[in-house]
């Protein structure tokens, strides 16, 4: 599907002291959606600063955000999910900066969970499985997953596999024998909805077995 918001790119920030970015999470708590915004500059003095969203809402014109430490947060069922909303930073009722945002283009999925790896001796492979809460959702159901794995000693040498299912097979011959591996997974919207990568799942660690040559078999 074509579109303009490139997955993983934050909304363009306004060129001023109050530039901010936001992400939405749909059906994050039952049928409730959430919207989270934060200033790009962590040093912004947020005292007296408020966030407000107007437009593309059901039954109301505007909603105010709650402030939680340095982030601003709304949980509601009132997002229309069609059309652009105007999100403004305000002080004393006066808007300092605003952005028009379609909430369906800034979706951040929930992190996958229950990641596990099972070695199949007969097949000489590893079956990677994980779960996602989005299988139960009605809106953001279709995701692309990014499975990343590395040998524990190779700090930055991550291998990545993109897949749309929640099951992946890694062939033993493509992994180093007798090595400890770390594996993790994250998700991004992949049908109609657009936005950002989820947080990574907790890492899972597994060890590959030694090479077991049959009698008379040559070392590769």
């Amino acid at each position: 599907e074509s579109g303009y918001a490139q997955n993983g790119d934050l909304e363009d920030a306004e060129l001023d002291d109050y530039s901010f970015s936001c992400y939405s999470q749909l059906e994050v708590n039952g049928s409730q959606h959430s919207l989270t915004c934060a200033f790009e500059d962590p040093d912004v003095n947020t005292t007296n600063l408020e966030f407000e969203i107007c437009g593309a809402l059901v039954e109301v014109k505007c909603l105010s955000f709650r402030k939680l430490q340095e982030i601003y947060f709304i949980e509601t069922k009132k997002f229309l999910l069609i059309g652009k909303s105007n999100i403004c930073v305000k002080v004393g009722g006066k808007s300092l900066t605003c952005k028009k945002i379609d909430l369906t283009t800034i979706v951040k999925p929930e992190a996958p969970f229950d990641l596990s790896v099972i070695y199949r001796e007969g097949a000489n492979d590893f079956v990677v499985t994980f779960n996602t809460s989005h299988l139960q959702k009605k809106y953001v159901k279709v995701l692309m997953h990014d499975v990343a794995y590395r040998q524990e000693k190779d700090e930055n040498k991550w291998m990545h596999v993109n897949l749309s299912s929640t099951k992946l097979t890694l062939l033993q011959r493509n992994l180093q024998p007798e090595a400890m591996y770390e594996i993790k997974v994250r998700s991004i919207p992949d049908h109609y909805f657009k936005g950002f990568w989820s947080e990574w799942s907790p890492s899972y660690y597994f060890r590959t077995p030694e090479i077991n040559n049959s009698p008379g078999e040559m070392d590769p």
């Epitope: 599907e1 579109g3 303009y4 652009k84 379609d102 009605k138 809106y139 109609y192």
Partner: antibody, heavy 118, light 111 residues
Framework: QVQLVQSGAEVKKPGASVKVSCKAS????????LHWVRQAPGQGLEWMGG????????AYNQKFKGRVTMTRDTSTSTVYMELSSLRSEDTAVYYC???????????WGQGTTVTVSS | DIVLTQSPDSLAVSLGERATINCRTS??????????MHWYQQKPGQPPKLLIY???NLESGVPDRFSGSGSETDFTLTISSLQAEDVAVYYC?????????FGGGTKVEIK
Amino acid sequence: QVQLVQSGAEVKKPGASVKVSCKASGYRFTDYELHWVRQAPGQGLEWMGGIDPKTGGTAYNQKFKGRVTMTRDTSTSTVYMELSSLRSEDTAVYYCARSGGRWYFDVWGQGTTVTVSS
Amino acid sequence: DIVLTQSPDSLAVSLGERATINCRTSESVSIHLLHLMHWYQQKPGQPPKLLIYGASNLESGVPDRFSGSGSETDFTLTISSLQAEDVAVYYCQQSIKDPYTFGGGTKVEIK
């Protein structure tokens, strides 16, 4: 008020190119994507593609890929649609339209008639 | 491409009477309660005008005699009490999948 003003009518020969402009006013140019929709004489509407004025990112109808190019000039709040290798069936009224949301069109230009004739 | 089939092709209705236009899509254009179907009115020599977005949301400034309904593959535009100024061609449009396609149009006339 919000307005999209398009360039004037064009007459072109087959094989030539045409470039139509659409100047936006009355709102912040980078807030809304702009699309192009054409209508052949006595026919229905056909979406050609769109551009995000903020990033310059484009989305084209596969039918026109390779023949259509959409660009923008943020300094003048103008978008352009260039269609190349014109043929007689490209004779149509070409509209630019603002996308109020994904992807419906809440403000339309007045239309630009392009006639392709030898 | 998603094909939108409007019916009828043309419709003659008395002033003050109800006009109903249907639009059927070749595949679903809904994601749960998000219905990516929109309706436009076009008068001769003019560009189209947005009436309804998201199947049932009335665009600002559009008279409330216009209403929309439907989900999945079947949608309806209703003019509750036809006025002389409503004589026009009406188009449906889907935006769930590129290319974003329009119906063939329904011509509404006064009987």
